[in-house]
Amino acid sequence: TTSAEKNTCQLYIQTDHLFFKYYGTREAVIAQISSHVKAIDTIYQTTDFSGIRNISFMVKRIRINTTADEKDPTNPFRFPNIGVEKFLELNSEQNHDDYCLAYVFTDRDFDDGVLGLAWVGAPSGSSGGICEKSKLYSDGKKKSLNTGIITVQNYGSHVPPKVSHITFAHEVGHNFGSPHDSGTECTPGESKNLGQKENGNYIMYARATSGDKLNNNKFSLCSIRNISQVLEKKRNNCFVESGQPICGNGMVEQGEECDCGYSDQCKDECCFDANQPEGRKCKLKPGKQCSPSQGPCCTAQCAFKSKSEKCRDDSDCAREGICNGFTALCPASDPKPNFTDCNRHTQVCINGQCAGSICEKYGLEECTCASSDGKDDKELCHVCCMKKMDPSTCASTGSVQWSRHFSGRTITLQPGSPCNDFRGYCDVFMRCRLVDADGPLARLKKAIFSPELYENIAE
């Protein structure tokens, strides 16, 4: 086979007990893993990395640490208070030679607005990134640096899925060899030119993202140049040909009837686990209608749930999902009317998603309230609106000029929302905290390559 066909990066995804605690069930956790992987798969597949096309991702194996694993001494992620650098290191201390990349998903509020951390790949002579094998480092420990971590929490709030998906794409972008974007060509969101600015920054922007601007889920030319060099050199080391589904990864893929994982993970009475012989594994057991691995509308007794059963909670922008009685999948929810307030009145619903700014309800655009001299920053965490393409009219929702629309109500951004032109995130005290994007990885490099600087954690 030619190297051109080796285009699939196989992932090992682990989730810690806090991620499980937030999503509540194995099925919900698997759905999260699946949506994150699908999201980055779409981004990378549609990017031409200087002639290298159709880069895709496949989950090879998952490990879900449930709340029952919180006290398990073999679970490295059991500690409640771990900094982001240590959390990545705990992942890296495992041997991940069987995978292209290994990630841990968590629901922890790391310091300084950090949503993820990953080792940066390079074409040669550097440790870290895709296909990197486990080896001994100067701190005396064996480590796999084909790793990264992401969290779904920021300043006490949960980030929207689109932001979390971009965080995952961003961290994987580091593994693939891209540093943060810099320079005017690759940070258009920082431009003084309104036309350029309105499309936002690219995936590898160093600071904050809202996830809803045109460039937010695209790679910049800077990233493409860096990633293509790494792919050229490294992908033959561990990428595989795409095609076959992976029985045992917990996700029902084309060609599988069900997938409840390997025998040590499968708690399903309906599905043959991945350790079964070839003709049986990932197939429904005789006489069973469905498996819970197929979706939330299947009971533990392997039958479709009845027509009236709820399978998805009502959200700000969509009604609850109701099983239809003849499939395990939860049917799509009906959207609530466009311009319904959502995310605590800071945004509005657009086609069933909490996507637009509250400003759009009144034909205005969201903007950043920042004084030109940078002295008055008390409004950086207010929702601010302006007339379309007229930054001179930018003012807080609580301002005199928008009294007709907001009746003097100062609407503040949710903690964890981007602020000050995407330079930082709002904290719980409504202060805009700038992001130190490169600090954590620099500290971790120092720790691993100069062990005397390393502080161990206490259990």
Epitope: E379, H382, C394, G398, S399, V400, Q401, G408, T410
Partner: nanobody, 121 residues
């Protein structure tokens, strides 16, 4: 400490008139925007009218245009709302507010306790 005190509310028959006053103390508000807002039971607060420091910029909610008039007396540090042709739907608690600056971008940072206006049919 800035204080805004409303007065002049009460019970009035539909078609009648009332004049609300708002006295500001603790700071000279002659240079700042002043406004009136109202909140009916079970509803969100809504904008009624505002006036700039010089009186040169005035705006009204569509629902009160032509019936209500906002004015100010800088010497007395007081803003008024003259309400004519009152309707039952004007029933609400009326709040006086003062902005923190003299531009349209200033925020409404100071609020009174409110005065009840009830219009009976």
């Amino acid at each position: 400490k800035v204080q805004l005190v409303e007065s002049g509310g009460g019970l009035v028959q539909a078609g009648g008139s009332l004049r609300l006053s708002c006295a500001a103390s603790g700071r000279t508000f002659s240079r700042y925007y002043m406004g009136w807002f109202r909140q009916a039971p079970g509803k969100e607060r809504e904008f009624v009218a505002f006036i700039s420091g010089t009186g040169g910029s005035i705006d009204y909610a569509d629902s009160v245009k032509g019936r209500f008039t906002i004015s100010r007396d800088s010497a007395k540090n007081t803003v008024y709302l003259q309400m004519n042709s009152l309707k039952p739907e004007d029933t609400a608690v009326y709040y006086c507010a003062a902005a923190s600056g003299n531009s349209g971008r200033s925020t409404w940072d100071y609020w009174g306790q409110g005065t009840q206006v009830t219009v009976s049919s």
